[in-house]
């Protein structure tokens, strides 16, 4: 559980998190889990304002999602 402080090197991106390809990184408990266990934000309608640039551990976009919408948490080696 996330009871203690987290450490980031200044404002740098964190070190890569080694999730196997079928897994995604759960940001809330900080470990790799099956991607299907995580739920991304609701799809935005086409034409909605584009989201902020993705960070290393944000969900990635996929074909079939609404314009610029995150579809799945980023799997594999992050």
């Amino acid at each position: 559980m996330r009871r203690g402080p987290r450490s980031l090197r200044g404002r740098d991106a964190p070190a890569p998190t080694p999730c196997v390809p079928a897994e995604c990184f759960d940001l809330l408990v900080r470990h790799c889990v099956a991607c299907g266990l995580l739920r991304t934000p609701r799809p935005k309608p086409a034409g909605a304002s584009s989201p902020a640039p993705r960070t290393a551990l944000q969900p990635q976009e996929s074909v079939g999602a609404g314009a610029g919408e995150a579809a799945l948490p980023l799997p594999g080696l992050l």
């Epitope: 559980m1 996330r2 009871r3 402080p5 987290r6 980031l8 404002r11 991106a13 964190p14 940001l27 809330l28 408990v29 889990v33 299907g36 266990l37 995580l38 739920r39 991304t40 934000p41 609701r42 902020a52 960070t55 290393a56 551990l57 944000q58 969900p59 995150a70 948490p73």
Partner: antibody
Framework: EVQLVESGGGLVQPGGSLRLSCAAS????????WNWVRQAPGKGLEWVGY???????YYNPSLKSRFTISRDTSKNTLYLQMNSLRAEDTAVYYC???????????WGQGTLVTVSS | DIQMTQSPSSLSASVGDRVTITCRAS??????????MHWYQQKPGKAPKLLIY???DLESGVPSRFSGSGSGTDFTLTISSLQPEDFATYYC?????????FGQGTKVEIK
């Protein structure tokens, strides 16, 4: 579209127990984070705790000893067992589903629990 | 626990006004380059409604007059042009660390 329906609220005497239910449809409770949030009359929101996809629970430390969150995956239903109830537990209790970032984007309508003699 | 402090606690405004609500966390709610800060709107007798997640991302279906900004410990919710349906109470919430915590709320009333 996720839909959440709470039930089980009502009047209970101090020291009593109550179990609230939250029936989910539109998604499996074995995905994501399923929360209970409460709101005392005229007050703000207070997070009670969550149960996640793996069945792991985490609670507001001020409530942990008296409140227990559980689930029945066969019924796709979330529960909040409340013991040793006090007058200050009087509140509307909401269940809410949180996304990848912990933002609660689906909420039930709430169920009122009144603790009074 | 991370304490969330909203200001003001209440405000009076008119339709068309630009409204700004601030939320300060007792420690940073940033991690992985993400701000784990969210904003909700609640009307009397109704469940809260998510407006903004991850500090600045507009929830699906929420009007574009709502926007969020900030990072670290200081965050802002802005309503660019207040509409009659926007009179409500607004809450910030952090999910950076357990236990998740809410601000005390800001009530936006009609002037």
């Amino acid at each position: 579209e996720v839909q959440l329906v709470e039930s089980g609220g009502g009047l209970v005497q101090p020291g009593g127990s109550l179990r609230l239910s939250c029936a989910a449809s539109g998604d499996s409770i074995t995905r994501g984070y399923w929360n209970w949030v409460r709101q005392a009359p005229g007050k703000g929101l207070e997070w009670v705790g969550y149960i996640n996809y793996s069945g792991t629970t985490y609670y507001n430390p001020s409530l942990k000893s008296r409140f227990t969150i559980s689930r029945d995956t066969s019924k796709n239903t979330l529960y909040l067992q409340m013991n040793s109830l006090r007058a200050e537990d009087t509140a509307v209790y909401y269940c809410a589903n949180a996304n990848y970032y912990g933002a609660m984007d689906y909420w039930g309508q709430g169920t009122l629990v009144t603790v009074s003699s | 626990d991370i304490q969330m402090t909203q200001s003001p606690s209440s405000l009076s405004a008119s339709v068309g006004d630009r409204v700004t609500i601030t939320c300060r966390a007792s420690e940073s709610v940033d991690d992985y380059g993400i701000s784990f800060m969210h904003w909700y709107q609640q009307k009397p007798g109704k469940a809260p409604k998510l407006l903004i997640y991850r500090a600045s991302d507009l929830e699906s279906g929420v009007p574009s007059r709502f926007s969020g900004s900030g990072s670290g410990t200081d965050f802002t919710l802005t309503i660019s042009s207040l509409q009659p349906e926007d009179f409500a109470t607004y809450y910030c919430q952090q999910t950076s660390k357990d236990p998740w915590t809410f601000g005390q709320g800001t009530k936006v009333e009609i002037k």
